[in-house]
Interface confidence: low
């Protein structure tokens, strides 16, 4: 399923778009990426409110969203193998577009420790509550979904697009309609700020086609950090309305001439810009000439200014912008140093955590410690890692090698271990015999029981019967459903394999088959090995079969 838009909020130097559609986190990121953005960051309370605003916009027009709880992907993810770090606000998660470990977080609940699979974060919206600024969406962490299974309850995602700057919305001085087309392929007629490189189409008039005039503008960078449309004077002006329509499209004051014409003006302390609509402060700092977090400091008599940088930054060659000082040059950390805007932080490799003597030191994480082991059974801690092991009768399984799966000894690589019936159980197996046979003390072979079975043409004669009663059948001619003697073809059953989970008694199979020549008077059982017990060990039904449990090492007894 694709993603539908769309709601847009542009503020500062970024635009946020909200989309509905059941996509995995990777598909959502790809969708944002195609238009030059990323899944949205929520790095501060202010940014959370911008994101909330765009979701509020989407939800008000999305009548289809009936779920009480809705989730929307954001760009916060933790890679497979990276463990939870409860000491950090982002708990070891990081923003998809990169960037520092930000201080703001709004987790829905305590996070479960896991380093095994990739985890992604969505915003959790309780649609039964009004979307007020005091109810900022909570962060919910979970699996990242896949194309076939996008993640439970995921209703959509939020993208963020960053720009060099924004233009003010175009001001109309009379009836008309503005349509903005943004670089991220969204059209809107109402944006609080319009991103650089957006196009604006203005259709003037009140819908009467004869009177309609069209204008086309592009939001351009007129000077460093100064963005405008290159239009002059209010658009769609009409002598009929004068200053009465939208204040003539003027930013501050509108002055009407007697002939219905009008001009825009500014209040004391402000000056009219080249667009003849917008007013800007005469204070040189009011145009925010300093960039990158630099503070504008007025010079004497308010004439000129200098830019000042916060701690951890220095002015670049333009003397307007602050650039980060790279503290990692001095190697202050034991393992990894991450330079962050205005500072740095030490990180530990996967399998280590901050700790030990000295600043930025790392110590091994004991993944096997009580309550945090990722292994289903045995866990061995190693320096910087761990490995899982399984008890006898189980092997490691799962994509991450942390689960244990029962070994089916009845279909083992060396062939079945029982001479007759074999029953697989959790972590073990046991052997059994068909009616008329009993299990030998070794728990593997079958011996003829006190009552023998006759051949299809009639029962064997008395001598034969007496001869076999109670004696162990030799290996070469053993009653083995699993393998015949060397050079002897295996007897095959004439019916389908009986299953222990079916209600049919096991004796319903044709048990009497003529033995191959060379072993007179010995009846071979059909090959019906691997009668796997469906839920724990079950006795074969019908007849006096005998069963013993067998360890993998060949000794009797249960594990």
């Amino acid at each position: 399923t694709g993603a539908d838009t769309e709601a847009v909020v542009c503020v500062g130097t970024a635009c946020y778009t909200a989309h509905s559609g059941k996509l995995s986190a990777a598909e959502a990121q790809n969708h944002c990426n195609q238009n030059g953005g990323n899944l949205a960051t929520v790095k501060s309370k202010e940014e959370a409110q911008h994101v909330q605003r765009v979701l509020a916009q989407l939800l008000r027009r999305e009548a289809a969203l009936t779920a009480r709880m809705s989730k929307f992907w954001i760009g916060l993810q933790r890679e497979k193998g990276k463990c939870l770090d409860p000491s950090l606000p982002l708990k070891g998660f990081s923003w998809v577009g990169g960037g520092e470990d930000t201080p703001y977080s709004n987790w829905h609940k305590e996070l479960r420790n896991s380093c095994i699979s990739k985890r992604c974060v969505s915003l959790l919206l309780d649609l039964s509550q009004p979307l007020l600024p005091s109810r900022l969406p909570k962060w919910s962490e979970g699996p990242c979904g896949s194309p076939g299974s996008p993640g439970s309850n995921i209703e959509g995602f939020v993208c963020k697009f960053s720009f060099k700057g924004m233009c003010r919305p175009l001001a109309l001085g009379g009836p008309g309609q503005v349509t903005y087309t943004t670089p991220f392929q969204t059209t809107s007629s109402s944006l609080e700020a319009v991103p650089f490189a957006s196009a604006a189409n203005v259709a003037c008039g009140e819908g009467d086609k004869d009177e309609t005039q069209s204008h086309y503008f592009l939001c351009k960078e007129k000077a460093p950090d100064v963005f405008d449309w290159g239009s002059s004077g209010p658009l769609c002006v009409s002598p009929k309305y004068g200053c009465n329509f939208n204040n003539g499209g003027c930013h501050q004051d509108c002055f009407e001439g007697g002939d219905g014409s009008f001009l825009c003006g500014c209040r004391p302390g402000f000056r009219l810009l080249d667009d003849l609509v917008t007013c800007a402060s005469r204070n040189p700092c009011s145009s925010s000439p300093c960039r990158g977090g630099a503070t504008c400091v007025l010079g004497p008599h308010g004439k000129n200014y200098t830019c000042r940088c916060p701690q951890g930054y220095q002015l670049d060659s333009s003397q307007l912008d602050c650039v980060d000082v790279d503290e990692c040059q001095d190697s202050p950390c034991a393992q990894e140093c991450v330079n962050t805007p205005g500072g740095f932080r030490c990180e530990c490799w996967v399998g280590y955590e901050p700790g030990g003597p000295g600043e930025g030191a790392c110590q091994d994480v004991d993944e096997c410690a009580l309550g945090r082991s990722p292994c289903a059974q045995g866990c061995t801690n190693t320096d910087g890692s761990f490995h899982c092991s399984c008890e006898e009768g189980y092997v490691l399984a799962g994509e991450d090698g942390t689960q244990c799966q029962d070994v089916d000894e009845c279909v083992g690589p060396g062939g079945p271990l029982c001479d007759s019936l074999c029953f697989n159980t959790q972590g073990s197996f046991h052997c059994g015999c068909l009616p008329g046979w009993v299990l030998a003390p070794n728990g593997v072979s079958c011996t003829m029981g006190p009552v023998s079975l006759g051949p299809p043409s009639g029962p064997p004669d008395e001598e034969d019967k007496g001869e076999k009663e109670g004696s162990t059948v030799p290996r070469a001619a053993t009653a083995s459903p699993t393998r015949g003697p060397e050079g002897t073809p295996k007897a095959t059953p004439t019916t389908s394999r009986p299953s222990l989970s079916s209600d049919a008694p096991i004796t319903s199979a044709p048990l009497k088959m003529l033995a191959p020549s060379g072993s007179p008077g010995v009846w071979r059982e059909p090959s019906i090995h691997h009668a796997t017990a469906a839920s724990g060990p079950q006795e074969p039904a019908g007849g006096d079969s005998s069963v013993a449990t067998q360890n993998n090492d060949g000794t009797d007894g249960q594990k």
Epitope: R53, A56, R60, P133, S134, N246
Partner: antibody, heavy 120, light 111 residues
Framework: QVQLQQSGAEVKKPGASVKVSCKAS????????MHWVRQAPGQGLEWIGE????????YYNQKFKGRVTMTRDKSTSTVYMQLSSLTSEDTAVYYC?????????????WGAGTTVTVSS | DIQMTQSPSTLSASVGDRVTITCKAS??????????MNWYQQKPGKAPKLLIY???NLESGVPSRFSGSGSGTEFTLTISSLQPDDFATYYC?????????FGGGTKLEIK
């Protein structure tokens, strides 16, 4: 300066509807939400609902849902509030007030009020 | 709905007096360190006027003798030295949750 200019007093019969207008000037109309608040004679203030003039989204107090409709005309920077199925309990002064778009939505500018009298 | 209870409902005082009006919310109106509580003044036949927003912030143009404090469920409006122009009705309002609700009002009259 920032002003909210409301329409004149209305007298209505029970069961009828009333439509009150509020014209904004002196600020960017689409940058603030517009709210409606009423005050019955000798009583306190009661919030009816709000409209976002930029996209025409509305939120209503559940108490008035089904009876109230808020609309806006961007070309004239005017917001309207229509209340239907009037009863004598709807006799009140109806105020429009603007609030910031997001954050603490306190009402920083108010209209002078429109008196609506419901009487048979 | 969040109920807002103001006390007293009527208060008699003289010019120069220090006056305190309290407002109690039926549940907290705080979120992420902010209090979504506002105070208005209303004179007969006039629209309300914003005095204090977010519990303690003075609206521009409002005299500094007005101040607000409190958090969670309990808030106060204080007039440090009553002036003749201050005799009016005062309302508290929460904007933390829909519906936005007002207190019943406190009428401040001349003693």
């Amino acid at each position: 300066q920032v002003q909210l200019q409301q329409s004149g007093a209305e007298v209505k019969k029970p069961g009828a509807s009333v439509k009150v207008s509020c014209k904004a000037s002196g600020y960017t109309f689409t940058s603030y939400w517009m709210h409606w608040v009423r005050q019955a004679p000798g009583q306190g203030l009661e919030w009816i609902g709000e409209i976002d003039p930029s996209a025409s989204y509305t939120y209503y107090n559940q108490k008035f849902k089904g009876r109230v409709t808020m609309t806006r005309d961007k070309s004239t920077s005017t917001v309207y509030m229509q209340l239907s199925s009037l009863t004598s309990e709807d006799t009140a002064v109806y105020y429009c007030a603007r609030s910031v778009y997001y954050g603490n939505k306190y009402f920083d500018v108010w209209g002078a009020g429109t008196t609506v009298t419901v009487s048979s | 709905d969040i109920q807002m209870t103001q006390s007293p409902s009527t208060l008699s005082a003289s010019v120069g007096d220090r006056v305190t009006i309290t407002c109690k919310a039926s549940q907290s109106v705080d979120y992420a360190g902010d209090s979504y509580m506002n105070w208005y003044q209303q004179k007969p036949g006039k629209a309300p006027k914003l005095l204090i927003y977010a519990a303690s912030n003075l609206e521009s143009g409002v005299p500094s003798r007005f101040s607000g404090s409190g958090s969670g469920t309990e808030f106060t409006l204080t007039i440090s030295s009553l002036q003749p122009d201050d005799f009016a009705t005062y309302y508290c309002q929460q904007t933390n949750e829909d519906p936005r609700t007002f207190g019943g009002g406190t009428k401040l009259e001349i003693k």
